[in-house]
Amino acid sequence: QHHGVTKCNITCSKMTSKIPVALLIHYQQNQASCGKRAIILETRQHRLFCADPKEQWVKDAMQHLDRQAAALTRNGGTFEKQIGEVKPRTTPAAGGMDESVVLEPEATGESSSLEPTPSSQEAQRALGTSPELPTGVTGSSGTRLPPTPKAQDGGPVGTELFRVPPVSTAATWQSSAPHQPGPSLWAEAKTSEAPSTQDPSTQASTASSPAPEENAPSEGQRVWGQGQSPRPENSLEREEMGPVPAHTDAFQDWGPGSMAHVSVVPVSSEGTPSREPVASGSWTPKAEEPIHATMDPQRLGVLITPVPDAQAATRRQ
């Protein structure tokens, strides 16, 4: 890992609306160099959102997570609290990114090229989405009708930064929230580790109630195929763009000193995602949200440009 980078590596242009603290596992302040202060929230499904530190719900959430972390530390867990440089603890798998969000995660490995848009099957495999219900797109097998989407709040558009597979690279997520006792999920993990290829539908899974305060995700778990296929009928409410197809291991092949400018570009402007009918109302996006957010996520591409820093070549030698 290379330290001492003070450059802003996550730029937040839009802030998320409220997220229950029950669903948050970590928070992190962005760097002072970013200018606009923001809190980066990580959800239980390892999705990152920008939040406004001045909002009361954000203050309450941070306070709650701090208390949780303190309780965990008292119970023998280890906990690292650092405010400052944001280092995603894993490489970002593609998530719903706003065009105006610039993400510059640190990465490891040698440089390699990346196709802008993999096939949808590849994307599903990379993101862990289920083929029946790709994120952000209504699947015909989704027979479930939800409660009516919030009329008052279509949810923020494109506020999710990216989704973080729990075990992937050597980056450490420095956070003010509970860490798991024992071998840490957030600690250095093998860069080469790939997600399990076993079909999740054939696995029987068990979750037993652990000792008090052990509310973080189970250690060593991989989140593939859960948060990535949310309710088709809701999936556009908060992040109107679904995850953008990209290889999850894309960042692993770049030099240790590489930075990545990530930008989302529409591949084609045709088509908008279909939605299941909702019995007692219809989805209404917030008036102030830009229309681009309703474009088909399958038609978005990711342009990822490795930008090696000055010392990268020397370090590689």
Epitope: T16, V21, Q45, L133, Q152, Q226, G227
Partner: antibody, heavy 122, light 107 residues
Framework: EVQLVQSGAEVKKPGATVKISCKAS????????IHWVQQAPGKGLEWMGW????????RFNERFKGRVTITADKSTNTAYMELSSLRSEDTAVYYC???????????????WGQGTTLTVSS | DIQMTQSPSSLSASVGDRVTITCRAS??????LAWYQQKPGKAPKLLLY???ALAEGVPSRFSGSGTGTDYTLTISSLQPEDFATYYC?????????FGGGTKLEIK
């Protein structure tokens, strides 16, 4: 049509263990969170814990920690709740319920099983 | 833990009446509140959730209001099928907690 169908009534002795099942249909099982809620006779509702079938992340109410285990068999779209070291105050109706996995919305319970009555008596 | 205090615990009213049930949280829950209706021997049914959104299939005579720690469920004109027990639930933080319930009976 979304349905959560729970196993039948159980009568157990104190100290025993019970395992209640909740079979889901009408949606993709791993796409929704499963919760278990207890309702003692003439009493209100008490949340026991959640389980995300897609990523094995449980969270439990302190009151039930150490005694409750939540499992899922994805091949049969069935969730299970096991409660051990039973005592008479565990006599209640137990419900499974689902919540949205667009987790940013939060866990309100939009679909419920019909409930399973557990009687703990010596 | 956030405690939810519901009042009144029971209430008698007639068809056509306007009824109000209140729920007070022991801490801020940022509008992450749901209301449920439960009839004897049945599972609860979702009525309203975050920011007072009406659940699918719920009649518009049900409405919610409130912010911070104090919330209200209003039934504008009681119908015979509305006599039941009503619960509020906060889902801002775990453990998720429910109010003690309000039993709505026919006068």
């Amino acid at each position: 049509e979304v349905q959560l169908v729970q196993s039948g009534a159980e009568v157990k002795k104190p100290g025993a263990t019970v395992k209640i099942s909740c079979k889901a249909s009408g949606y993709t099982f791993t796409n929704y969170n499963i919760h278990w809620v207890q309702q003692a006779p003439g009493k209100g509702l008490e949340w026991m814990g959640w389980y995300l079938p897609g990523d094995d992340s449980p969270r439990f109410n302190e009151r039930f920690k150490g005694r409750v285990t939540i499992t899922a068999d994805k091949s049969t779209n069935t969730a299970y709740m096991e409660l051990s070291s039973l005592r008479s105050e565990d006599t209640a109706v137990y419900y499974c319920a689902t919540s949205p996995t667009d987790e940013t919305q939060g866990d309100y319970f939009d679909y419920w099983g019909q409930g399973t009555t557990l009687t703990v008596s010596s | 833990d956030i405690q939810m205090t519901q009042s009144p615990s029971s209430l008698s009213a007639s068809v056509g009446d306007r009824v109000t049930i209140t729920c007070r949280a022991s801490g801020r829950i940022h509008d992450f509140l749901a209301w449920y209706q439960q009839k004897p021997g049945k599972a609860p049914k979702l009525l309203l959730y975050t920011d007072n959104a009406l659940a699918e299939g719920v009649p518009s005579r049900f409405s919610g209001s409130g912010t911070g720690t104090d919330y209200t469920l209003t039934i504008s004109s009681l119908q015979p099928e509305d006599f039941a027990t009503y619960y509020c639930q906060q889902f801002w933080s775990t453990p998720y907690t429910f109010g003690g319930g309000t039993k709505l009976e026919i006068k």
